[in-house]
């Protein structure tokens, strides 16, 4: 009777038709399952847990980008239940490889210890891993992260470095 219902459809016994599973709102994720003709009796939507977000629909909640821990970047906008975090410029002691192709994690900051000479974010940095690096005053423009995050919204990111 319902073998042709779609991924997000359940079979409504009252109408004899496939029907859209109730979509969740922003900041929510489905609880239990619904789709391909069946719907759990207690199917519904629940709020995203802390550190996660969802744009709604049938998406599960996904972890916010870990700007500092993974990207080694500052937090421009912290994430909430409805939005991913936005990363800003690199943390002190880290620099951006501007022309490097983006991978699935966007653009990652690299340690100044590995930087070519005269890298602007690293100018004035003393050698040694425990050195105090100056801020990125030479980079007053918006970080590429503010563009990269838009392409990545809805995708999960690793929380560890």
């Amino acid at each position: 009777e319902y073998s042709n219902c779609g991924e997000n459809e359940y079979y409504n016994q009252t109408t004899g038709l496939c029907q859209e599973c109730p979509p969740c709102g922003p900041g929510e994720e489905p609880y239990l399952s619904c789709g391909y003709g069946t719907k759990d009796e207690d199917y519904g939507c629940v709020p995203c847990p802390a550190e996660k977000f969802s744009k709604g629909g049938y998406q599960i909640c996904r972890r916010h980008k870990d700007c500092e821990g993974f990207f080694r970047a500052t937090v421009l906008t912290p994430g909430d239940m409805e939005n991913d975090a936005e990363c800003g410029p690199c943390l002190p002691g880290y620099y951006m490889l501007e022309n490097r192709p983006r991978n699935i994690y966007g653009m990652v900051c690299y340690s100044c210890l590995l930087a070519p000479p005269n890298t602007k974010e690293c100018v004035g940095a003393t050698s040694g891993a425990s050195a105090n690096f100056p801020g990125t005053s030479g980079s007053s423009t918006l970080s590429p992260f503010q563009h990269a995050h838009k392409e990545l919204s809805g995708q999960g990111h690793l929380a560890t470095a």
């Epitope: 009777e1 073998s3 042709n4 109408t15 038709l17």
Partner: antibody, heavy 121, light 112 residues
């Protein structure tokens, strides 16, 4: 009197899209699902899908999932179907039909007069 | 999808004759709720389809009693006891037990 009034014939070019309307009157628009059915020239009937005017939820025949978009305007009690990337295979008469599902009776009890779509360059 | 096979595809009759149209489905049309969602529609020339019979044997409102439906499982029949001029057209059987709803190819009832 319950009526479904459909928009006039369409002559469209291959690759273009077309949007047809179905104006409902004489009953509670949001109380019944609106279905769309295709009838190719001299052929049988094919179920495209339906929309629930109450909440805009839709379900479509797998065959038409990339082809048809179903919408409604509750304020004007009008249902719409848009067909995109038209080919000669889309030349047909398109009917809207009201769906009755009370007391486990499931059928199309009222049909529009149909809109003829001709795809030709 | 459930395939609905109608026979004959053309049925020449004289007015006053009895007519019989057969419809066979590729799967049983008995729903898990016990109902059998086999319907008959008539499409008169230049018009949209109209419901005649629903759930095998129930005449829709305003349908004359010369129309009757019967059958079960996968085999169904529509009978017209005495054909009148207004009965001419194409008859479609349709199932709504399984998703998606499907229709037969149609039987054209025409004068000899």
């Amino acid at each position: 009197e319950v009526q479904l009034q459909q928009s006039g014939p369409e002559l469209v070019k291959p690759g273009a899209s077309v949007k047809m309307s179905c104006k409902a009157s004489g009953y509670s628009f949001t109380g019944y699902n609106m279905h769309w059915v295709k009838q190719s020239h001299g052929k049988s009937l094919e179920w495209i899908g339906y929309i629930d005017p109450y909440n805009g939820a839709t379900s479509k025949n797998q065959k038409f999932k990339g082809k048809a978009t179903l919408t409604v305007d509750k304020s004007s009690t009008t249902a719409y179907i848009q067909l995109n990337s038209l080919t000669s295979e889309d030349s047909a008469v398109y009917y809207c039909a009201r769906y009755y599902y009370g007391d486990y009776h499931w059928y199309f009890d009222v049909w529009g007069a149909g809109t003829t779509v001709t795809v030709s360059s | 999808d459930v395939v609905m096979t109608q026979t004959p595809l053309s049925l020449p009759v004289s007015l006053g004759d009895q007519a019989s149209i057969s419809c066979r489905s590729s799967q049983s049309l008995v729903h898990s709720n016990g109902n059998t969602y086999l319907h008959w529609y008539l499409q008169q020339p230049g018009q949209s389809p109209k419901l005649l019979i629903y759930k095998v044997s129930n005449r829709f409102s305003g349908v004359p009693d010369r129309f009757s439906g019967s059958g079960s499982g996968t085999d169904f029949t529509l009978k017209i006891s005495r054909v009148e001029a207004e009965d001419l057209g194409v008859y479609f059987c349709s199932q709504h037990t399984h998703v998606p709803p499907t229709f037969g190819a149609g039987t054209k009832l025409e004068l000899k």
